[in-house]
Amino acid sequence: KSSNEATNITPKHNMKAFLDELKAENIKKFLYNFTQIPHLAGTEQNFQLAKQIQSQWKEFGLDSVELAHYDVLLSYPNKTHPNYISIINEDGNEIFNTSLFEPPPPGYENVSDIVPPFSAFSPQGMPEGDLVYVNYARTEDFFKLERDMKINCSGKIVIARYGKVFRGNKVKNAQLAGAKGVILYSDPADYFAPGVKSYPDGWNLPGGGVQRGNILNLNGAGDPLTPGYPANEYAYRRGIAEAVGLPSIPVHPIGYYDAQKLLEKMGGSAPPDSSWRGSLKVPYNVGPGFTGNFSTQKVKMHIHSTNEVTRIYNVIGTLRGAVEPDRYVILGGHRDSWVFGGIDPQSGAAVVHEIVRSFGTLKKEGWRPRRTILFASWDAEEFGLLGSTEWAEENSRLLQERGVAYINADSSIEGNYTLRVDCTPLMYSLVHNLTKELKSPDEGFEGKSLYESWTKKSPSPEFSGMPRISKLGSGNDFEVFFQRLGIASGRARYTKNWETNKFSGYPLYHSVYETYELVEKFYDPMFKYHLTVAQVRGGMVFELANSIVLPFDCRDYAVVLRKYADKIYSISMKHPQEMKTYSVSFDSLFSAVKNFTEIASKFSERLQDFDKSNPIVLRMMNDQLMFLERAFIDPLGLPDRPFYRHVIYAPSSHNKYAGESFPGIYDALFDIESKVDPSKAWGEVKRQIYVAAFTVQAAAETLSEVA
């Protein structure tokens, strides 16, 4: 096909036509449609929604829409044998039991198949013992307990508050500390914003509200039984004992009414400092065990959930590119929810639906994108990013050769204050340029650009006059594309004011109260923030799929590489004596970054000057840009994390949600002063510097003139 078939109207007009076609009212309508019943992964309801989306995407005009199914390990509570926690007296009698379900929100009393709160993939068990309060159960919290306070968690049931880090990391930390069970709870300090009412009168968490969620430590593996390969019809599955990332101790979540009953009796050590106190009227004593009068009472967990291999369904839609059909720009977000999914994921799925509709409208008018756009509705994200990971495993050879970019589309909102973007540095300039062209939806910024309101409300800590853009971590479906395959990725959503709202995420996250009404009444009544997110996500996809030269700026990678090298060197320099003793030098890394900077600068100059009418040269330059992210992939992966292969970024080993730079070096340096064999530990630091320096140098060379 000739290139002018792709651009039968001017590119600027195409983008405007695409953006103008996006309507807030449609997003609202789609959100309502997607949130009337639960769509738990592996259930009939979610299969029916997959078929509905398939049908509608076809109607919207996509070239093809297919279901891709996999049989993966999921986890469900036992319907006849509910999970709960009790306080038992010396005779073993249960004198207090936690609630078995959340009180349903108004209007939803008769909805069936609301899964009760549970920690997905918890093993079965009925441990009983003394309680230890471990704050957020972060690495540093257990250091404080074990090293400073000399409190031993071995054989204890620990209670941890949700927030700050991914719940799976909390469970892993508790396991390593020797705990025999974990109770997770939402403290009002983290999930109840001052001056706001509880749902249904406001967006705060009521005392009976509970956060569901998986507690896996998959490290990018996907289905626990088929790591590295798709869970298809002929898959070989590991035995459950060899499954990846499953917790070994029972875990259960509760709300703050129930937590109050457990925490109010706590004795033992006082909290070490104010950062260990939440907002409940309890002492926040660490324990172990209950205070004087109640010292003979214990806590008992009753967990009967089961792990089951279950069929899941992704919806994959294709809009074929007119000029480069073998280059894929992917927009994907998940469809499965814990209950109604009012925010997570359907506020994102509704935006994807409207983006597909707009692209379809343009296609029906005779337009096609230059490159192929793939749209995905992922299943089983809540159970460990399973749908996206299995699909990427099945299609890895195509993706690593043809994948230009992946844009994630989970929740469109987690607040209504300003934009939040996490992406590869390659996309910084794309995001800046796009947001300068979009109108801000914010009050007080009428007639101003989104870039202006975003920069004002969320300024970059390094560069004045620019907005903050964060590193990609994980905990969402971009993981396999970015961390495993090295496909340039990004995500955007509207967020809260992090300075004034210190609660973690949004209060009703993964609770039964995450409804359509929550969004329509309290977060975005006009759906103007949803529309803005649709414009950002859709605009990014449009530019990535349609611009003649890929909108990636490799110079921005050079800038952050220098920043990350400085940061990791400074962390290492906290140990000057050891660095000298073991001859640790970062010279090779700094040198590689310097080379990258110079080569990137020269590449950018050539990019300005080359003959764009020569399709071979154009394709060559675009391929160098496309494959740059791929060049940061180490085929051997990070130590003990083979599916995290990106050398520059990985999810933090202490918090899956957060991104860490130069993760191999960072992890080698972490807590190095406590290592039993310092020579071996510093040897590993040196090896990781070598790997990082080599990778940066190798990536730089992919940008050199080809001959």
């Epitope: 400085d566 320099m573 000057p576 004596q577 660095m579 000298k580 030098s585 700094f590």
Partner: nanobody
């Protein structure tokens, strides 16, 4: 022979800013092969690196102290300086300026050190 000499007040009040200057003689501060740094040692504690700077003014700071530290360089005077804000008694130490090979912790020259006491 390269020499480094620290100068500045030996007594600083809590919450105030500690300011020290290091004068380099017998060689130029404008070498790309070296960083110029500050280190300190308090009684019963190990050596603590505070931060470093290169001739172009590029700085590296100890993450634990980063929010309070500023290091600057004046190549015309062959000097570099340390400012540490909001000091407490825990900042009482012997402060040394030093030269080290770029991207390493190989301190090959250092000043004789100056004791700074934080007290009201």
């Amino acid at each position: 022979q390269l020499q480094l000499q620290e100068s500045g007040p030996g007594l600083v009040k809590p919450s105030e800013t500690l300011s020290l200057t290091c004068t380099v003689s017998g060689g130029s501060i404008s070498s790309s092969n070296y960083f110029w740094g500050w280190i300190r040692q308090s009684p019963g504690k190990g050596l603590e690196w505070i931060g470093s700077i290169d001739y172009s003014g590029y700085t590296y700071y100890n993450p634990s102290l980063k929010s309070r530290v500023t290091i600057s360089v004046d190549t015309s005077k062959n000097q570099f300086s340390l400012k540490l804000s909001s000091v407490t008694a825990a900042d009482t130490a012997v402060y040394n300026c030093a030269r080290h090979k770029a991207a390493t912790a190989d301190f090959d020259y250092r000043g004789q050190g100056t004791l700074v006491t934080v007290s009201s």
